[in-house]
């Protein structure tokens, strides 16, 4: 079943998704789509990364985190009720049927009165600290592996910790920093 996240109309929504790149320059392509993850790729793609860049995005969808360190969490700006639904984060690990797929349910609530200024970006920026990317050693002496070695435990751990979406919203609104 999908993990559920909430946001109010007019706020930014945050949908977490993480992986651990094995080595510099060896990032894994990721796609985000509206709708549950299909067998292959993402349906209704809203954002896509390749081995180095965000190479496709549509308006209001962007990555605010350290996407080159594996934080591919999606930010949706200024949400409306139409943004409600299932979103797919697909980490496209090389090899047949190796992809990791995560379905996240976004529930948009009507604004109470006037949307208050959100601390969404503070909250988003805090989350990469939960991701322990493997130590790479001195920058000048790196050797790349031929294929990524993905550690996906952080994703399920984070999903469990954020399962209570009310907690997530409380943290976001308070500007709390998770370490």
């Amino acid at each position: 079943s999908e993990v559920e996240y909430r946001a109010e109309v007019g706020q930014n929504a945050y949908l977490p998704c993480f992986y651990t790149p094995a080595a510099p320059g060896n990032l894994v392509p990721v796609c985000w789509g509206k709708g549950a993850c299909p067998v292959f790729e993402c349906g209704n793609v809203v954002l896509r990364t390749d081995e180095r860049d965000v190479n496709y995005w549509t308006s209001r969808y962007w990555l605010n985190g350290d996407f080159r360190k594996g934080d591919v969490s999606l930010t949706i700006e200024n949400v409306t009720l139409a943004d409600s639904g299932i979103y797919c984060c697909r980490i496209q690990i090389p090899g047949i049927m190796n992809d990791e797929k995560f379905n996240l349910k976004l529930v948009i609530k009507p604004a109470k009165v006037t949307p208050a200024p959100t601390r969404q970006r503070d909250f988003t920026a805090a989350f990469p600290r939960m991701l322990t990317t493997r130590g790479h050693g001195p920058a000048e002496t790196q050797t790349l592996g031929s294929l990524p070695d993905i550690n996906l435990t952080q994703i399920s751990t984070l999903a469990n910790e954020l399962r209570d979406s009310r907690l997530a919203n409380d943290l976001r609104d308070s500007g709390a920093t998770i370490r």
Epitope: G25, R52, D53, V54, S59, L63, Q142
Partner: antibody, heavy 120, light 107 residues
Framework: QVQLQQSGPELVKPGDSVKMSCKAS????????MDWVKQSHGKSLEWIGY????????SYNQKFKGKATLTVDKSSSTAYMELHSLTSEDSAVYYC?????????????WGQGTTLTVSS | DIVMTQSPDSLPVSLGERATINCKAS??????VAWYQQKPGQPPKLLIY???NRYTGVPDRFSGSGSGTDFTLTISSLQAEDVAVYYC?????????FGQGTKLEIK
Amino acid sequence: QVQLQQSGPELVKPGDSVKMSCKASGYTFTDYYMDWVKQSHGKSLEWIGYIYPNNGGTSYNQKFKGKATLTVDKSSSTAYMELHSLTSEDSAVYYCARGGYYSYYSYDYWGQGTTLTVSS
Amino acid sequence: DIVMTQSPDSLPVSLGERATINCKASQSVGNNVAWYQQKPGQPPKLLIYYASNRYTGVPDRFSGSGSGTDFTLTISSLQAEDVAVYYCQQHYSSPYTFGQGTKLEIK
């Protein structure tokens, strides 16, 4: 220490091609992207493209597709850029720059630049 | 393409005073912005990466801030050797684009 040593100035005729080099030292060449940047006289900087020496993968600014070709020679840790069908608009200083993962692919080391003059 | 617009184009500042250069992206680029300093006849030099991280060896009078579309480079106390042209650059998505440059000079 990390160094990017670029080839010397070039004076070429319109319509010709030119190939400039960027020799890397002081780090593992295949671990970092090599980007190329153009700076016309008194102007800002324009990104041309990058090559990933590990697998030869390239990405180009659409504006420079067909104009620039990026290659590497891993054995000598050297990156090359060839510019084709030259016109006066191509007269500029061209830099190679290392795209550092640890600096989120901003350019932590630059070559000294190769000055290209296209004139008949 | 993402357009990076710097302001002002030219900035006269007295020695010891604060200098502030702004950069606005036409679309959100997260924190994927770098700042470079270029002196005449030299290649650019990396000052700030990922919007607010000071690069190795850069004096602590240089600082960067911002996220999304609005970014700032601040020099807390201008020194004579800081006279140069400063460029912002987004490296969120290719083609990576630079601002038009801000010429910092002594008032």
